[in-house]
């Protein structure tokens, strides 16, 4: 029988007593083979941290700074349930650290050298931690102590319980540094008062501060926020335009064997017997006897963490990078304004060592880093591990929604101005065997389909956003008799058809020979009855194009395209025989690397790119013998997106909306994780 | 102007095994890291092996495990231990530098 306890961990008498009342309270209400309470208590979260690690516990409720050390090693733990509050409708679990000055006030992030600041307090998140942290390796030498490089820094703070005799310039901006309400300039609100009053020209607070203060939207108009890309914002898109985004209140457990599932089934059954409003007798948002005991009181309940999300993830890459900063106090050798190296990612080993190529050949500009699946380079790249990588537009979604930017596009025909003039797109299109005269459209139920990956726009999004709408449905391998669609579930039968050997069977990226757009065209070739693929994919693979063993021998003309009227026309007609026009692969990175990426990538290709005549000889950026390694082999150029510089931008409403559609049947872990810290 | 001269290459039966050597003239040679790609007859020039100035190594596929690249910047040397050799890896060896163009390359041939 498995054992459904849950140790939870207490730090202090009050907790251990409500944890005993929690644990008698919950024996009461859920059966016998359901999970149940025991108590361990410690003499600090720290201590809690630890005895997790050590299996001596299993939960505890840690703010945000904790949760950054639980993760550290060697305690390696992970958020799994995290309070919320608000309303059930609209649940909040974060919060957003922000910069608020006056409108008229005129300087940006980088200017902040010589104002006057407005803290909440010494050492605490928003006020403190948060921007300090993201301010560090622009402070001035030496850092240590900190708050005296703080006060160097600026011209003049009011940082409530800083040491005025040591550091009389904190305190310059409220006499005193007084640590409690009784300073009029203590907490948020004091550090908003602190802005408003005209004593600092930055107040650093949360998101909901400027709300609480100022009802009245005119008033609120008189102030801006101050964003990380050297931008300002309206106080109201505090969602586009904070320095970091920071979880409340959360549950954390071993990232290995850490009861996660048995932790939620607890808490969700807590909850709805002993939630807000629930019982008399015991409340688990509530503490009698102290505050915030075991969970905030101000919390509303708990919401499930998704599995795929980190504690780096979970707390974000600019609260992460401002916690080590201050934690580990390390800075850059070299001089801010020139670009470090670009981290370029690359999937599974083919792409590794052509990106190891470009590295060497690049002379120290590129570095790489390996990662398995496009969803855990994505991962690498919000987290920092990595810095870019060019991505299919339905990864260009899924990026975006975490946060990343599209920096430039591939551009696939050659024209004069090349990198000044992104295209429209390509076509994806379905193509299938002429041979197979019967097969259209609207009977492709039962037959056996060839995919470039699950996610991906041409081989995924396009054909199954199409039928969805025909069948109302996800169950898209019953609706195909087998296919091959790298990246399904092992045991689905649109793994069936796919050809990787042992771990690598289904799996998406070069060592599944049916990945990727010559990959699916090779699954029609050898078993599939259909393909759905880009619309230059037949023609890069026939006629003696592609040297392989496979293709070597192809005609362009034993091929034809399904077209959605019902017809075939041949495939050099695709411009009246498509699915949808897809948008084309695009360059994706964090905001903060935008600058620099773009500047590297535009030297990288005149270097590298089309206009290497030889690429026997010498490095070729756009080449791999048709495997589409790091980039696409038909890659002329890569373009400037003036201002298509969002994923809602360059993508389109229509792809956007098409791709939001077919979310009901998303099977991406990075997507839920994504949309759990941005809904 | 830096040259690269590969060498150590030679006739060898299915199984065996050969050094090649490539030797740089000048100075800073392999500061940003060295390639050995081979050219069979009628076929692309394919990367074989690579090692960077950290001493990272990246081999293909196909010759992980046989073939061990090394360096001595002492001697301006960058070093490839071919075993267990198969017919396959019949083709003319160079190396390359960043800034350097291809030497002569050095002739392997596997065959019984």
């Known amino acids: 029988v498995p054992d459904k306890t849950v140790r939870w961990c207490a730090v202090s008498e009050h907790e251990a007593t409500k944890c005993q009342s929690f644990r008698d309270h919950m024996k009461s209400v859920i059966p016998s083979d359901g999970p149940s309470v025991a108590c361990v208590k410690k003499a600090s979260y720290l201590d809690c941290i630890r005895a997790i690690a050590a299996n001596e516990a299993d939960a505890v409720t840690l703010d945000a700074g904790l949760v950054y050390d639980a993760y550290l090693a060697p305690n390696n733990l992970k958020p799994v349930v995290a309070e919320f509050y608000g309303s059930k409708e609209d649940p909040q679990t974060f919060y957003y650290a922000v910069a608020v000055v006056k409108k008229d006030s005129g300087f940006q992030m980088n200017q902040l050298r010589g104002k006057k600041s407005c803290h909440t307090g010494l050492g605490r998140s928003a006020g403190w931690n948060i921007p300090i942290g993201l301010l560090y390796c622009d402070l001035p030498e030496p850092r240590k102590p900190l708050e005296k490089a703080v006060a160097n820094f600026f011209s003049g703070s009011c940082a409530p319980c800083a040491d005025g005799t040591d550091f009389p310039q904190l305190c310059q901006l409220c006499p005193g540094c007084g640590c409690s309400t009784l300073n009029q300039y203590f907490g948020y609100s004091g550090a908003f008062k602190c802005l408003k009053d005209g004593a600092g020209d930055v107040a650093f607070v949360k998101h909901s501060t400027i709300f609480e203060n100022l009802a009245n939207k005119a008033d609120r108009d008189q102030y801006e926020l101050l964003c990380l890309d050297n931008t300002r914002k309206p106080v109201d898109e505090y969602k586009d335009c904070h320095l970091a985004q920071v979880p409340s209140h959360t549950v954390v457990a071993r990232s290995m064997g850490g009861k996660e599932d048995l932790i939620w089934e607890l808490l969700n059954q807590a909850q709805e017997h002993f939630g807000k409003d629930k019982s008399k007798e015991f409340q688990l948002f509530s503490s009698p006897h102290g505050k915030d005991l075991l969970f905030k009181d101000s919390a509303h309940g708990f919401l499930k963490v998704p599995p795929r999300m980190d504690a780096k993830m979970y707390l974000g890459y600019e609260y992460v990078t401002a916690i080590r900063n201050l934690r580990e106090g390390t800075c850059p050798e070299a001089p801010t304004d020139e670009c470090k190296p670009v981290k370029w990612c690359a999937l599974s080993h083919h792409e590794r060592l052509k990106c190891d190529e470009w590295s060497v050949n690049s002379v120290g500009k590129i570095e790489c880093v390996s990662a398995e699946t496009t969803e855990d380079c994505i991962a690498k790249i919000m987290n920092g591990e990595a810095d870019a990588m060019s991505l299919d537009g339905g990864f260009v979604y899924i990026a975006g929604k975490c946060g990343l930017v599209p920096v430039l596009a591939e551009n696939y025909n050659k024209s004069d101005n090349c990198e000044d003039t992104p295209e429209a797109g390509y076509f994806a299109i379905a193509v299938v065997k002429k041979s197979a005269s019967d097969l259209t459209w609207d009977n492709l139920k039962g037959k056996k389909s060839c995919h470039t990956a699950v996610g991906r726009t041409a081989g995924w999004n396009i054909p199954m956003g199409l039928l969805y709408n025909k069948i109302n449905h996800c169950r898209f391998d019953e609706f195909f008799s087998e296919g091959c669609a790298p990246g399904s579930k092992k045991d689905s039968s649109l793994c069936k058809l796919c050809m990787g050997s042992g771990l690598n069977l289904c799996e998406p990226n070069n060592k599944e020979g049916y990945y990727g757009y010559t990959g699916a065209f090779r699954c029609l070739v050898e078993k599939g009855d259909v393909a759905f693929v880009k619309h230059q994919t037949v023609p890069q693979n026939t006629g003696g194009k592609n040297p392989d063993p496979w293709a070597k021998n192809l005609n362009e003309k034993d091929y034809e395209l399904l077209c959605l009227d019902g017809t075939r026309k041949p495939v050099e007609e695709y411009a009246n025989c498509h699915l949808a026009r897809a948008p084309n692969h695009a360059v994706v990175t964090r905001k903060d690397k935008e600058a620099c990426v773009h500047k590297i990538l535009r030297q990288q290709q005149h270097l590298f790119g089309s206009n290497v005549t030889d690429c026997s000889g010498n490095f070729c950026l756009f080449r791999s013998e048709t495997k589409d390694l790091l980039f696409r082999d038909d890659t002329v150029c890569l373009a400037k997106l003036h201002d298509r510089n969002t994923y809602e931008k360059y993508l389109g409403e229509e792809y956007v909306k098409a791709v939001g559609n077919l979310r009901k049947c998303s099977t991406s872990s990075l997507l839920e994780a994504c949309t759990f810290r941005r809904p | 102007q830096v040259q690269l001269v590969e060498s150590g290459g030679g006739l060898v039966q299915p199984g065996g095994s050969l050094r090649l050597s490539c030797v740089a003239s000048?100075?800073?040679?392999?500061?940003?890291?060295v390639i050995w790609y081979r050219q069979a007859p009628g076929k692309r020039r394919e990367l074989v092996a690579l090692?960077?100035?950290?001493?990272?190594?990246n081999y293909r596929e196909s010759v992980k495990g046989r073939f061990t690249i090394s360096r001595d910047d002492a001697k301006n040397t960058v070093w490839l231990q071919m075993n267990a050799l198969e017919p396959e890896d019949t083709g003319v060896y160079y190396c390359?530098?960043?800034?350097?163009?291809f030497g002569q390359g050095t002739q392997v041939t596997v065959s019984s």
């Open positions: 000048g100075s800073g040679f392999g500061i940003n890291g």
């Open positions: 090692i960077k100035s950290d001493g990272y190594t």
């Open positions: 390359k530098t960043p800034g350097v163009p």
